[in-house]
């Protein structure tokens, strides 16, 4: 806190300019009018104030706007945004995408800070859903943003927003998140033709059910092994050898290198060894010939 002292004669600030960097903290407190500061916030960013001086300027704004800053001020906070606490930001009502972009720019190149996370949360809640423009903006600044959301939060993403999602945006998503995103992607891309559809849906397939994988196997999609390895194990297990062969196309040879890893390992255990042998890859661990396979889970469901 800076002590309240009278502004020395001739030092009253008439505008926010570089002369203020020569003011001591108490002089800034005494000589800079908070209302003037609020209307000329955009100038602050072009002046090399010390961190201590910025603290004084923030304090002045806090006194002027105890209930939270108006958006006209927020949009021009620039570097001063990094001085804000999550508690400060929770008082704000940010509705403009331009304001959001301006503040994300300040934090560009850094990890998502608690301030930024709070800002995004306030913005999205204010909009009611993650619309395409917002998602475009957020994933441009933070490619991992989508995967930082809970399945519940992801449920508010409209299918139309899925068009903004790039493959790298899903890199850190877990199966529960993809379970929510996949049906939205399927809906968003439903009017595309086979090969184009597969290119778009591929990143989301970690949430695909068995019946959709069976359908894809009929379309000569040539799924790569990296995508196959990210599929849900429970979705892969019911696939036949012929279906997996059609699904992977020329990439089927990659199964050998992955035979000890899920979901390939678990899938092999469910196939007849005879059927696996037809692939000519030397895959071992299938059900020996002559054995009867009882699906106990089906039996339990019936009883």
């Amino acid at each position: 806190e800076v002590e309240k002292t009278a502004c020395p004669s001739g030092k009253k600030a008439r505008e926010i300019d570089e002369s203020l960097i020569f003011y001591k903290k108490w002089e800034l407190e005494a000589c800079v009018d908070a209302a003037l500061l609020a209307t000329q916030m955009d100038r602050v960013n072009a002046i090399p104030f010390t961190y201590e001086q910025l603290d004084v300027l923030k304090h002045k704004l806090d006194e002027l706007y105890p209930q939270g800053y108006p958006e006209s001020v927020i949009q021009h906070l620039g570097y001063l945004f990094l001085k804000m606490s999550p508690e400060d930001i929770r008082k704000w009502n940010v509705t403009s995408l331009e304001t959001l972009k301006a503040l994300l720019e300040v934090n560009k190149g850094h990890e998502m800070s608690p301030q930024v996370a709070t800002l995004i949360d306030r913005f999205v809640k204010g909009r009611g859903q993650l619309d395409k423009d917002t998602l475009d903006t957020l994933t441009a600044f933070y490619p991992g943003y989508l995967c930082s959301l809970s399945p519940e939060e992801l449920s508010s993403v409209p299918p139309s927003s899925i068009w903004a999602v790039r493959p790298q945006d899903l890199d850190t998503c877990d199966p529960r998140q993809l379970d929510v995103l996949y049906p939205k992607a399927r809906l968003a891309f439903q009017n595309m033709n086979g090969s184009e559809y597969f290119v778009k849906i591929q990143s989301f397939l970690g949430g695909a059910p068995t019946e959709d994988l069976k359908a894809l196997s009929q379309q000569n999609v040539s799924m790569d092994l990296a995508t196959f390895m990210k599929l849900r194990t429970d979705a892969v297990l019911p696939l036949t050898v012929a279906e997996v062969q059609k699904l992977l196309g020329p990439h089927v040879e990659g199964l050998k290198a992955e035979e000890r890893h899920r979901p390939v390992r678990d899938w092999i255990l469910r196939q007849r060894q005879d059927d696996l042998d037809t692939l000519g890859l030397g895959l071992q661990g299938g059900i020996p010939n002559g054995y009867l396979v009882l699906d106990l889970s089906m039996q339990e469901a019936l009883s």
């Epitope: 955009d42 960013n45 090399p48 104030f49 620039g78 301006a102 300040v106 560009k108």
Partner: nanobody
């Protein structure tokens, strides 16, 4: 991305020093630069300022007529020429850059020590 100051040292009263503030990893063209100093146990104070274009300069009253700030954008460096040094000019001098292309970036150097004795 950082600012690196150099040129400090020990000098007798009345002597001169030329401090440099060089940008590493980014270009200074769009940035306004300020020189600051901090004496032991005292508040950091602004010494000099130069606009991004170099067309505008400003100085603290205590150094006017003795210090001159300049910039060489080709060398990505800002200079502070200090003449007629006094014991009260002693302190750690650091430079700060503000503005940038998006007008929202800010960098600080670690400082260089100046002793007038």
């Amino acid at each position: 991305l950082q600012l690196v100051e150099s040129g400090g040292g020990l000098v007798q009263p009345g002597g001169s020093l030329r401090l440099s503030c060089a940008a590493s990893g980014f270009t200074l063209d769009y940035y306004a630069i300020g020189w600051f100093r901090q004496a032991p146990g005292k508040e950091r104070e602004g010494v000099s300022y130069i606009s991004s274009s170099g067309g505008s300069t400003n100085y603290a009253d205590s150094v006017k007529g003795r210090f001159t700030i300049s910039r060489d954008n080709a060398k990505n460096t800002v200079y502070l020429q200090m003449n007629s040094l006094k014991p009260e000019d002693t302190g750690v001098y650091s430079c700060a850059a503000a503005g940038g292309y998006s007008n929202s970036s800010r960098y600080w150097g670690q400082g260089t020590s100046v002793t007038v004795s």
